[in-house]
Interface confidence: low
């Protein structure tokens, strides 16, 4: 007969015998044996390990390095790494948010379709017809042409993506 | 089925040896360590011997130590009990039992199996 | 060594009421992973022992789940809910945290 091939969940093969693994929050001091069960440890302050494990060592709890734009959004347990995020105006350059970037600002004729979070940068969209953008901003959309006609007037210039339309009293003479 | 068969025991003189066998069938006897218990008759438990899964770790209590050998052989599955210098206090119902561990979430599960039991009497 | 200390010794119970054992350690039998290395063990008459408890609260296989261990440290309780007929026996702790492995004296369980 052969001994186990394979463990049960949370289980590790070592020797031929499966040993507990150590829960989140531990790390592996000891394997079991025939005569003692695994022995764990908790991890240290700043560290942490976020599975059932049998690692040595616990793993550092991540730095937000202010001089990279960075801030904690979440501080780190014994079984969680810190999250960081950006600061105000700023985003993430990966999902593992390492550093930070200015947000983008939608130039004239571009609006924000989605404003820009510590994650995510700005969105930007093309103003449609009927809709223009005249500055360059993270936050601003596209804004509608303004409606002469509800104003008793008539466009004496037409809008484009980056101007909005003229409008102008009416002509009498052609009453 | 699981189980564990004893053979072995029987009346011997102070000064003499024996030797006791324990015979597991039904799961895979070379994963597992292995244990004597002893009792004397009308009295309670004493802890004798253990072994590892592969024979490499072997303890004695103190009572049986250099005089009692724990051994096993997983080609033919069985545990076995070497008694020597064998003395009137060793007199005693023997007993193996296996360390429950490979299959259960806890790498330790008590001694979930023993053997039925074989008698050693020491006496002139 | 470890000595395992158990009280009653003798313990005259009726079918159908509750039955407590205590075993007290002269050390704490909780290991550093938060487990506590003490067995529970029946022994019928006749009979050779059996697993009742493990690591002090665990329920072997195929025990009823009537019996039941509880405690931590160096103090621990075996507990019958209902006693039958067939729990008469002498009941023993075991403390597994070192070898050599130690009993307690055994509390012998019989009907009134």
């Known amino acids: 007969p052969e001994p186990p091939t394979a463990c049960r969940e949370k289980q590790y093969l070592i020797n031929s015998q499966c040993c507990s693994l150590c829960q989140p929050g531990q790390k592996l001091v000891s394997d079991c044996t025939e005569f003692t069960e695994t022995e764990c440890l908790p991890c240290g302050e700043s560290e942490f390990l976020d599975t059932w494990n049998r690692e040595t060592h616990c793993h550092q709890h991540k730095y937000c390095d202010p001089n990279l734009g960075l801030r904690v959004q979440q501080k780190g347990t014994s079984e969680t790494d810190t999250i960081c995020t950006c600061e105000e105006g700023w985003h993430c350059t990966s999902e593992a948010c390492e550093s930070c970037v200015l947000h983008r600002s939608c130039s004239p004729g571009f609006g924000v379709k989605q404003i820009a979070t510590g994650v995510s940068d700005t969105i930007c969209e093309p103003c449609p017809v009927g809709f223009f953008s005249n500055v360059s901003s993270a936050f601003e959309k596209c804004h509608p042409w303004t409606s002469c006609e509800t104003k008793d007037l008539v466009v004496q210039q037409a809008g484009t993506n980056k101007t909005d339309v003229v409008c102008g009293p009416q002509d009498r003479l052609r009453a | 089925e699981v189980q564990l068969v004893q053979s072995g025991g029987g009346v011997v003189q102070p000064g003499r040896s024996l030797r006791l066998s324990c015979a597991a069938s039904?799961?895979?006897?070379?994963?597992?360590?292995m244990h004597w218990v002893r009792q004397v008759p009308g009295k309670g438990l004493e802890w004798v011997s253990v072994?590892?899964?592969?024979?490499?770790?072997?303890y004695h209590a103190e009572s049986v130590k250099g005089r009692f050998t724990i051994s096993r052989d997983n080609s033919k599955n069985i545990l076995y009990l070497q008694m020597n210098s064998l003395r009137p206090e060793d007199t005693a119902v023997y007993y193996c039992?296996?360390?429950?561990?490979?299959?259960?979430?806890?790498?330790?599960?008590?001694?979930?199996?023993w053997g039925q039991g074989t008698t050693v009497t020491v006496s002139s | 060594d470890i000595q395992l200390t158990q009280s009653p010794l003798s313990l005259p119970v009726t079918p159908g009421e509750p039955a407590s054992i205590s075993c007290r350690s002269s050390?704490?039998?909780?290991?550093?992973?938060?487990?506590?290395?003490l067995d529970w063990y029946l022994q019928k008459p006749g009979q050779s022992p059996q697993l009742l408890i493990y690591?002090?609260?665990n329920r072997a296989s195929g025990v009823p789940d009537r019996f039941s261990g509880s405690g931590s440290g160096t103090d621990f309780t075996l507990k019958i809910s209902r006693v039958e007929a067939e729990d008469v026996g002498v009941y023993f702790c075991?403390?597994?945290?070192?070898?050599?492995?130690?009993f307690g004296q055994g509390t012998k369980v019989e009907i009134k």
């Open positions: 690591l002090a609260s």
């Open positions: 050390q704490s039998l909780l290991y550093s992973n938060g487990k506590n290395y």
């Open positions: 039992a296996r360390r429950g561990t490979v299959t259960n979430y806890y790498s330790y599960s008590g001694l979930d199996v």
């Open positions: 072994i590892s899964y592969d024979g490499d770790n072997k």
């Open positions: 039904g799961f895979s006897f070379s994963s597992y360590a």
């Open positions: 075991m403390q597994a945290l070192q070898t050599p492995r130690t």
